[in-house]
């Protein structure tokens, strides 16, 4: 079996002239292509992998939402020579439906990494964007995380930063077929320069309460009991399990397959940095 082979980060790697073909190992009888597109309120980008696959032919599409970060994953496997270049890599399924330029900034600023390399998305070097409230949702948190796509024995990953709807999420994630979008949220302008090792507690969680020491007593006793009328103490955990996606259809149009133009299909390049506020 012969398959197309490429790895795309943002809009480089699977551009038309850079396509490769590979002969698959004996016993490998499917070609695979996987595309994962991510949209923040300030732009979108995609990751893609093409190559020799494993398993059975078929398709698997999924839409995901992580605190207002949208993801759309398409995985396709096929059993013919060079059949794995059918998916559109331009992320247009995630184009916003309405004109959101009417939304004013809400006062919060975040570092934004939309299709930037890991080198360009370090510390305070990425561009700063002004958050705004969109589609009846308040975007007052900042996010720092990663998107990872695995297919054809290849893993490709890019950082993601931007404005989100949650200010306190800790190591949250959503997953799809061979795809993970995960990270943490924070409160306050430009707070998302590096959230890899940080833990946040929501003000909705009752605070830790220091219990008073036991009263001195003249009665010899092997046990001492103290009581408190304060709020119960929650166990403090630095990590929390990955929640199941709260919504498989985050926005109208995200579930359906990427739209096609009438022109010859353009397989290369993600449509990156298209601002939802334009």
């Amino acid at each position: 079996l012969e398959c197309y082979s490429c790895v795309q980060k943002a809009d480089d790697g699977c551009s038309p002239n850079k396509m490769k073909t590979v002969k698959c190992a004996p016993g490998v009888d499917v070609c695979t292509e996987a595309v994962g597109a991510v949209e923040t309120i300030h732009g979108q980008f995609s990751l893609a992998v093409r190559g020799c696959g494993s398993g059975l032919p078929g398709k698997n599409d999924r839409g995901l939402d992580l605190h207002g970060l949208l993801a759309f994953i398409q995985l396709q496997q096929c059993a013919q020579d060079r059949c794995n270049a059918k998916l559109n890599l331009t992320s247009r399924a995630l184009d916003p439906a309405g004109n959101e330029s009417a939304y004013p900034p809400n006062g919060v600023e975040c570092y934004s990494c939309v299709g930037l390399s890991r080198e360009a998305c370090q510390g305070t070097s990425p561009p700063v964007v002004s958050c705004y409230n969109a589609s009846d949702h308040v975007y007052k948190g900042c996010f720092d995380g990663n998107v990872t796509l695995t297919a054809a024995n290849v893993t490709v990953s890019l950082p993601v930063r931007g404005c989100v709807q949650d200010e306190f999420c800790t190591r949250d994630g959503v997953t799809g077929p061979g795809f993970t979008l995960s990270g943490s949220c924070c409160q306050g302008s430009r707070c998302n320069s590096d959230l890899r090792n940080k833990t946040y507690f929501s003000p909705r969680i009752p605070p830790l309460v220091r219990l008073p020491p036991p009263e001195p007593t003249t009665v010899a006793s092997t046990t001492s009991v103290t009581t408190s009328t304060s709020a119960p103490v929650r166990p403090t955990s630095t990590t929390k399990p990955m929640p199941a996606p709260t919504s498989q259809t985050p926005r109208q149009g995200v579930e359906h397959e990427a739209s096609r133009d009438e022109e010859p299909r353009l397989t290369g390049g993600a449509a990156g940095h298209q601002d939802r506020s334009n």
Epitope: K18, T21, T90, G272, Q274
Partner: antibody, heavy 117, light 112 residues
Framework: EVQLLESGGGLVQPGGSLRLSCAAS????????MSWVRQAPGKGLEWVSY????????YYADSVKGRFTISRDNSKNTLYLQMNSLRAEDTAVYYC??????????WGQGTLVTVTS | QSVLTQPPSASGTPGQRVTISCTGS?????????VHWYQQLPGTAPKLLIY???KRPSGVPDRFSGSKSGTSASLAISGLRSEDEADYYC???????????FGGGTKLTVLG
């Protein structure tokens, strides 16, 4: 119908500058990788530069690196090539080309750049 | 000197079959990058003839075919016609140069 129309060519002295434009129509320009390819008189094709759909990824041929700058304005459906420090060997017809099916599937008619003293 | 090597000229009589070769290296054709072929008629812009090693865009006659093996590719034209007289270029991506590369071109002459 896909159309690519180059303009901005002309006569320039060595060391001078020119800016070429390529107006695109008939397709979704913002989704297409674009290139400039040149052809010196009586010679073969030489790829010059390459820009991704968003403009964030750019490649240049070694022969023009540091002198030429490719850019695009997706709102105007226009591709540009800023050429500085021009040399006699840059004399050529400059074509803009669209990437479609793994190749340059549409080409403009070209604009002639002549560098001479 | 071009990165991809083509014979400078080729010729044939009407009805004949002609083959044009394109030899690359391990950083382009040998690296697995697909090969494209362009036809340039006198005084006109190049036109895509074969893409993805052996596929024809709509409108290109099936007399034109492409193939690729190892670090080489070839273009075959069967049932040669006078209107096939043109320059033919192969092209591929090159890993080492990080750019597209063309062959030097082959001038095809249809005799008689």
């Amino acid at each position: 119908e896909v159309q690519l129309l180059e303009s901005g060519g002309g006569l320039v002295q060595p060391g001078g500058s020119l800016r070429l434009s390529c107006a695109a129509s008939g397709f979704t320009f913002s989704n297409a990788w674009m290139s400039w390819v040149r052809q010196a008189p009586g010679k073969g094709l030489e790829w010059v530069s390459y820009i991704s759909s968003s403009g964030s990824t750019i490649y240049y041929a070694d022969s023009v690196k540091g002198r030429f700058t490719i850019s695009r304005d997706n709102s105007k459906n226009t591709l540009y090539l800023q050429m500085n420090s021009l040399r006699a060997e840059d004399t050529a017809v400059y074509y803009c080309a669209r990437e479609g099916l793994w190749a340059f599937d549409y080409w403009g008619q070209g604009t002639l750049v002549t560098v001479t003293s | 000197q071009s990165v991809l090597t083509q014979p400078p000229s080729a010729s044939g009589t009407p009805g004949q079959r002609v083959t044009i070769s394109c030899t690359g290296s391990s950083s382009n054709i040998g690296a697995g990058y697909v090969v494209h072929w362009y036809q340039q008629l006198p005084g006109t812009a190049p036109k895509l003839l074969i893409y993805d090693n052996n596929k024809r865009p709509s409108g290109v006659p099936d007399r034109f075919s492409g193939s690729k093996s190892g670090t080489s590719a070839s273009l075959a034209i069967s049932g040669l016609r006078s209107e096939d007289e043109a320059d033919y270029y192969c092209a591929a991506w090159d890993d080492r140069l990080n750019g597209a590369v063309f062959g030097g071109g082959t001038k095809l002459t249809v005799l008689g």
